[in-house]
């Protein structure tokens, strides 16, 4: 069962794993979470009755029974690890620390203007995990205002110890603030010759890569695929580091791959989530339990219910014994990775679904799309919103996307005359207009929030975040879609897509059924061609074909541009404006999402 | 783990320069303050200068003229220059790490001694 | 520059005695005092840092007060290990400067 609250004056007996130093007991729970094992935990709160030495001990714990017994304890917070609970998972912690001195390896020391300043730093490095900051009050005249990046094996601090006027805190990249690149190429028949920081066994490059991406020092991997010439090492998947942060020396080797960590494009990638099934493949390691199971499908099921499987092999049923069903080995190890991979022995291996709740929930797998037409067909874009207006009649307003939970993007030209949030109403889920009666059930708007350097759709900034009076409980009909990453400002999107319920052509109407229309993307430079009278700045991105004929029009407004990138769909633009509809040489003007990263994540995810 | 290891001529004659290094491990220079501290034979301890994790240098007001101090990040060493050398400066030479103004960790120092 | 004037510069004490030294800066330099140990023959030894945290490690018989130009260093409990010479620093502005040190011997 999901236990979410703290248990004060109260510890766990037995059950260590490991200890490691986080600034709270809520630091600790999240740290527990994302430890393959960790089911409990005990954290040590500063108190007079406390050694010094124990202050913000977080003690990892695991049990078969998955509880321990309590023992009172002042000073000690207990709790369970979100493992067991099925709601979103974060690691972003923007919690900055006063008083206290997160000790680690410092390998950056500069001064800096504040300590938000220093996490940017921090978020910014390729090696920071968390940054210690002396503020200007700080007793020693010298050090105010020095900034320490540090980090550690582990990612939490080796000690933390009180000190007077300086602030500490983690770094923002599992927050998706980060500018870093974002390098997704996994790079055939190549080894990256550098320092080994640890080794696990991975069925496929993707897993390693994924591996690599949520352990704390890897930057980078090789992984030896299972036609290796050296048996040993097959299925190895080596992750890496160096002090440049880039690998130095790169080997041509055939059946290796080599990539890089995708830590500054986690939010929009999955990277806990494993899902695949490999066929004809054992995965080994310490034996959980054993159970009948009808398919592989169902034994990855039983997988991911059973809180302390980590992966599974499910060896299908001999003919007709068993009522057909064969058997399902659940397992585990002490990385979360198989301690062996065998190859050739009938059995289909994979891993719990349960970590997937740890990444963003936009990078789930949609359902395939329909090729060709212009009607889409319900579940084909489960972000689409259709955004009402109550004032004076019913109507659709605009177009919008899911990005959270509680959040629709949309452009801020689309509130022009809106008075309140009132006479706001969202539909999700809808493939036609016709669908929505007066008892369909809407989502109510809580707040609008225009960015507040926005005039006019056409000199930029036209875009508004919708807080929602209840959130979206997400299904194959209405789930979020990805923001592009920060990292991601170079990549070239060649699969867009314009969608809406607005005018086919410049005098029509709204139409019933959502309709799509694929749209190449178009350079700023041959957009700011096509528009002399008008400045487009790199906050837009265009988009159309130059004999026109496809774009979006009066009534897709605020709605996406959609674009596929690594099989995950990204919010490249919103619907913002252009000159007249499908005209020849004049693209669809949208707001360039990537560059309003900061401002969305500043708005939803301020405290 | 951290240490700090001081290495220098033993002897040196009298308006030389003297130099000596400090060779660190299990830290970065990047990262961390390294100062200089000497101790005359049966004296106390006199604060000679120190470079920060970023380059910058600060030195006693006394020996400015005489002193420089340097580092390579990548060979983790920092150096300790000394001119015109005279007895008063025989003493046993320390590097040390910064930690807030505060010296963490002290090399075991290496005896200098100035002599013709 | 900031001078360090450390009183008294040796004592004598029982083993199990209070043993009090204090330093007296020639400005104000907050709480940015450290002190340290120095056995013979070996590099000194940080106890105490910013007047009064304690280093990793030091027995919290060893302890710090004080505040702009007055600052004392206590040993609770005088122990035979605790032979040294002790010595203040400045560390609230460069160039960073010393006390002129404290022996501590056992009557």
């Known amino acids: 069962e999901c236990v979410t609250q703290l248990l004060k004056d109260t510890c766990f007996e037995g059950g260590d794993i490991t200890t490691v130093f986080t600034p709270s007991a809520k630091y600790c729970q999240v740290v527990c979470t994302y430890h393959p094992r960790c089911l409990l935990f005990t954290f040590t709160a500063e108190s007079p009755s406390e050694d010094p030495t124990r202050w913000f001990t977080c003690v990892l714990k695991d049990s078969v029974t998955e509880t321990l017994p309590r023992v009172n304890r002042t000073a000690a917070i207990s709790g369970y690890s979100f493992k067991q609970c099925s709601h979103q998972i974060s690691a972003c912690n923007k919690d900055i620390y006063v008083d206290l001195d997160m000790k680690g390896i410092n390998y950056n020391s500069s001064v800096a203007k504040s300590a938000q300043e220093c996490q940017e730093r921090c978020t910014d490095d390729v090696h920071c995990h968390f940054f210690t900051y002396a503020t200007r009050q700080f007793p020693s005249l010298e050090h105010r205002n020095i900034c320490l990046l540090k980090h550690t094996q582990t990612g939490t601090p080796t000690r933390i110890t009180k000190l007077d006027k300086v602030v500490s805190g983690f770094s923002l990249k599992s927050c998706a603030l980060s500018n870093l690149a974002c390098i997704r190429d996994i790079f055939p028949n190549t080894v990256f010759a550098d320092s080994n920081i640890d080794s696990v066994m991975a069925p496929d490059a993707f897993v390693c890569g994924r591996i690599c991406t949520h352990h704390p020092g890897c930057l980078f991997f090789t992984f030896f695929s299972q036609e290796w010439p050296k048996e040993s090492q097959r299925n190895l998947c080596l992750l890496k580091t160096s002090e440049s942060g880039l690998p130095s020396t790169r080997i041509k080797k055939s059946k290796a791959l080599s990539g890089f960590s995708l830590q500054s494009c986690r939010h929009s990638i999955p990277v806990f989530c494993h899902s695949s099934f490999y066929h004809d493949t054992d995965f080994l390691g310490e034996e959980l339990d054993i159970v009948a199971a009808k398919s592989h499908e169902a034994c990855q099921k039983l997988c991911t219910n059973a809180v302390r499987c980590q992966f599974f092999t499910y060896t299908p049923a001999q003919a007709s014994c068993n009522e057909g069903k064969g058997k399902c080995y659940l397992k585990l190890s002490s990385n979360g990775s198989p301690t062996k991979i065998l190859h050739g022995r009938g059995g289909i291996s994979g891993y719990t679904l349960r970590l997937c709740k740890m990444d963003n929930e936009c990078t789930t797998k949609i359902k395939p799309r329909i090729v060709g037409g212009t009607a889409s067909v319900r579940g084909e874009w489960p972000w689409q919103v259709t955004l009402h207006t109550t004032s004076p009649t019913q109507r659709h307003l605009c177009g919008g996307s899911i990005i959270g939970n509680q959040w629709i993007l949309t452009a801020a030209h689309c509130f022009y005359g809106v008075e309140s949030p009132k006479i706001l109403r969202v539909y999700s889920g809808i493939l036609n207009q016709s669908e929505i009666k007066e008892d369909t059930s809407f989502f109510g708007v809580q707040e609008i929030i225009i960015h507040d350097q926005y005039k006019m759709a056409e000199s930029g900034y036209d875009i508004a975040l919708l807080k929602l009076e209840t959130t979206v409980n997400y299904t194959d009909s209405q789930r979020p879609i990805c923001l592009p990453s920060k990292g991601d400002r170079n990549v070239i999107y060649t699969d867009c897509w314009v969608t809406g319920w607005g005018y086919r052509k410049l005098r029509d109407k709204i139409q019933n059924t959502l309709q799509k229309a694929k749209i190449p993307l178009v350079t700023n430079e041959e957009c700011q061609k096509r528009y002399r009278g008008h400045k487009i700045t790199h906050k837009m991105i265009c988009a159309g074909y130059r004999e026109g004929g496809k774009d979006a029009c009066k009534g897709d407004s605020g709605g996406p541009l959609s674009c596929k990138h690594n099989e995950v769909w990204h919010l490249v633009g919103i619907t913002s404006w252009g000159e007249g509809c499908a005209q020849r040489e004049r693209p669809g003007v949208y707001t360039n999402v990537v560059e309003y990263v900061d401002w969305i994540l500043e708005k939803t995810q301020a405290v | 783990q951290v240490q700090l290891q001081e290495s220098g001529p033993g002897l040196v004659k009298p308006s030389e320069t003297l130099s000596i290094t400090c060779t660190v491990s299990g830290f970065s220079l990047t990262g961390y303050g390294i100062y200089w501290v000497r101790q005359p034979p049966g004296k106390g301890l006199e604060w000679l200068g120190m470079i920060w994790g970023d380059g910058r240098t600060d030195y006693n007001s006394a020996l400015k003229s005489r002193v420089t101090i340097s580092k390579d990040n990548s060979k983790s060493q920092v150096s300790l220059k000394l001119s015109s050398v005279t007895a008063a400066d025989t003493a046993r030479y320390y590097c040390?790490?910064?930690?807030?103004?505060?010296?963490?960790?002290w090399g075991q120092g290496t005896t200098v001694t100035v002599s013709s | 520059d900031i001078q360090m004037t450390q009183s008294p510069s040796s004592l004598s004490a029982s083993v199990g005695d209070r043993v009090t030294i204090t330093c007296k800066a020639s400005q104000d330099v907050s709480t940015a005092v450290a002190w340290y140990q120095q056995k013979p023959g070996k590099a000194p030894k940080l106890l105490i840092y910013?007047?009064?945290y304690r280093n990793t490690g030091v027995p919290d018989r060893f302890s710090g007060s004080g505040s702009g130009t007055d600052f004392t260093f206590t040993i609770s409990s005088l122990q035979p290990e605790d032979i040294a010479v002790y010595y203040c620093q400045q560390h609230y502005k460069t160039p960073y400067s010393f006390g002129g040190g404290t022996k501590v011997e056992i009557k």
């Open positions: 910013l007047t009064s």
């Open positions: 040390a790490r910064d930690y807030y103004g505060s010296k963490d960790y």
